[in-house]
Interface confidence: medium
């Protein structure tokens, strides 16, 4: 007779693992049992289960509740047995033992590998902001045996570095991802990916990129000097500017208060019927928490009676 | 060639206590469940005590639990069976048995329970 087994046994942690075992016999012969040990190099074999025909199945203290026999209709040559509950301490050599009349006994090891899948986490790094060099966006971590693979999808452009911890029985894997802030990175998708053959698809886990910066300030609204004159409605100076995070923006004139009657209105300054009081030097500061910048403008209401040319000047600073 | 050979049978008295014995060769008896059984006269033969291979887990008939205990010793290939409190309904001719699907059967030894 021969005896028929796995050279390895693959499940995945909290899993039952059937470890086969099928004895094919000749004509005549019987099995009397089936024992099953574990028989890892350097220890003593530990006895799981006694299969017996008649008075069925034995499971010895240390395996009790977590040895059964695969559910009926059994074949009376098939000394396989189920493994409940796989966790990663049963990893290792096992042995059937099966003992036939008269022919004698029969043995077959196999090896029991407990897949252990990861559970990654996703760790942003410290702030980014756009004039630093190259700086960390992220690092993904997971653990597993055996090893996960970790990688990145982005459209980002950046680099990437990996570094294994091997622990007794599993391996944990951090994969950094570095890139240079710019803000075109603001609200763009870092993914890590983890693979392992525990899964049954990739584990992803995507973090939003947020690039502090603060854009040059400048100030619309004098593009046309001529409208500029006494007693025009709905003059208003806007300024522009853009950040992460989104910034703040306050007016002041440099040469004294604001005129009685001028609104502020967060990025806008308006303007009652123009009078000659109006003319001087707005300043727009704009801030966020990563940066400010101002951008100053000269206001030059003209009389229309009055030939003379009018002047506009305009100074941005940061 | 199996070989299985019974003895420690005899005459005894009600409540009291015999010790049988069941010498193995010709396999490995390390291997196997090994079990005892009895016939009286007149009657089918019926199942007294087993005993697991690694000498765990024995198993009794109703009638002798608590009275008889199975135990094997591998170093030596021999299966006992303690019988205490005997009572005259014991009387039997006692059996040593391979536990496989189609019992091997020794030649088996008297065991007489009377005043």
């Known amino acids: 007779g021969e005896l028929e087994t796995s050279d390895v046994v693959t499940v995945v942690l909290g899993q039952d693992a059937k470890l086969p075992c099928f004895y094919r016999g000749d004509s005549g012969e019987q099995v009397g049992q089936v024992a099953w040990a574990r028989v890892d190099a350097g220890e003593g074999a530990q006895e799981l289960a006694l299969l017996h025909s008649k008075y069925g199945l034995h499971v010895s203290p240390a395996y009790e509740g977590r040895v059964e026999q695969p559910p009926p209709p059994r074949n009376p040559l098939d000394g396989s047995v189920l493994l409940r509950n796989a966790v990663q301490a049963d990893e290792g050599e096992y042995e059937c033992r099966v003992s036939t009349f008269p022919a004698g006994s029969f043995q077959a090891r196999l090896r029991l590998r407990v897949l252990v899948p990861p559970l990654p986490s996703l760790n942003p790094g410290p702030a980014l902001e756009e004039g630093q060099g190259l700086t960390l966006a992220a690092s993904c971590t997971a653990e597993g045996s055996p090893a996960p693979s970790v990688t990145w999808d982005t459209e980002v452009k950046g680099t990437t570095s990996s570094r294994s911890f091997k622990h007794s029985r599993s391996a944990a894997v951090t994969s950094e991802f570095h890139l240079v802030p710019s803000r075109s990175m603001n609200g763009q998708p870092l993914t890590c990916v983890v693979s392992h053959p525990g899964l049954l698809q990739d584990q992803r886990i995507t973090h939003i990129l947020h690039v502090s910066f603060l854009a040059e300030a400048s100030v619309r609204g004098l593009e046309d000097q001529n409208l500029w004159h006494i007693g025009r409605e709905g003059a208003m100076l806007k300024c522009l500017s853009e950040g992460q995070p989104p910034p703040s923006y306050n007016w002041t004139r440099l040469d004294g208060p604001l005129p009685s009657g001028v609104r502020v209105d967060g990025d806008t300054l308006g303007f009652p019927p123009l009078t000659t009081e109006h003319s001087g030097i707005y300043v727009c500061h704009v801030s966020n928490e990563f940066s400010s910048r101002d951008s100053q403008v000269t206001v030059d209401v003209l009389d229309p009676q009055e030939d003379s040319g009018k002047q506009v000047d305009l100074v941005s600073a940061s | 060639e199996v070989q299985l050979l019974e003895s420690g049978g005899g005459l005894v008295q009600p409540g009291g206590s015999l010790r049988l014995s069941c010498a193995a060769s010709g396999f490995t008896f390390s291997d196997y469940y090994m079990g005892w059984y009895r016939q009286a006269p007149g009657k089918e033969r019926e199942f007294v005590s087993a005993?697991?291979?690694?000498?765990?887990?024995?198993y009794y008939a109703d009638s002798v639990k608590g009275r008889f205990t199975i135990s094997r010793d591998n170093s030596k290939n021999t299966l006992y069976l303690q019988m205490n409190s005997l009572k005259p309904e014991d009387t039997a001719v006692y059996y040593c048995?391979?536990?496989?699907?189609?019992?091997?059967w020794g030649q088996g030894t008297q065991v007489t329970v009377s005043s």
């Open positions: 005993i697991s291979s690694t000498g765990g887990s024995p």
């Open positions: 048995a391979v536990e496989v699907p189609y019992d091997y």
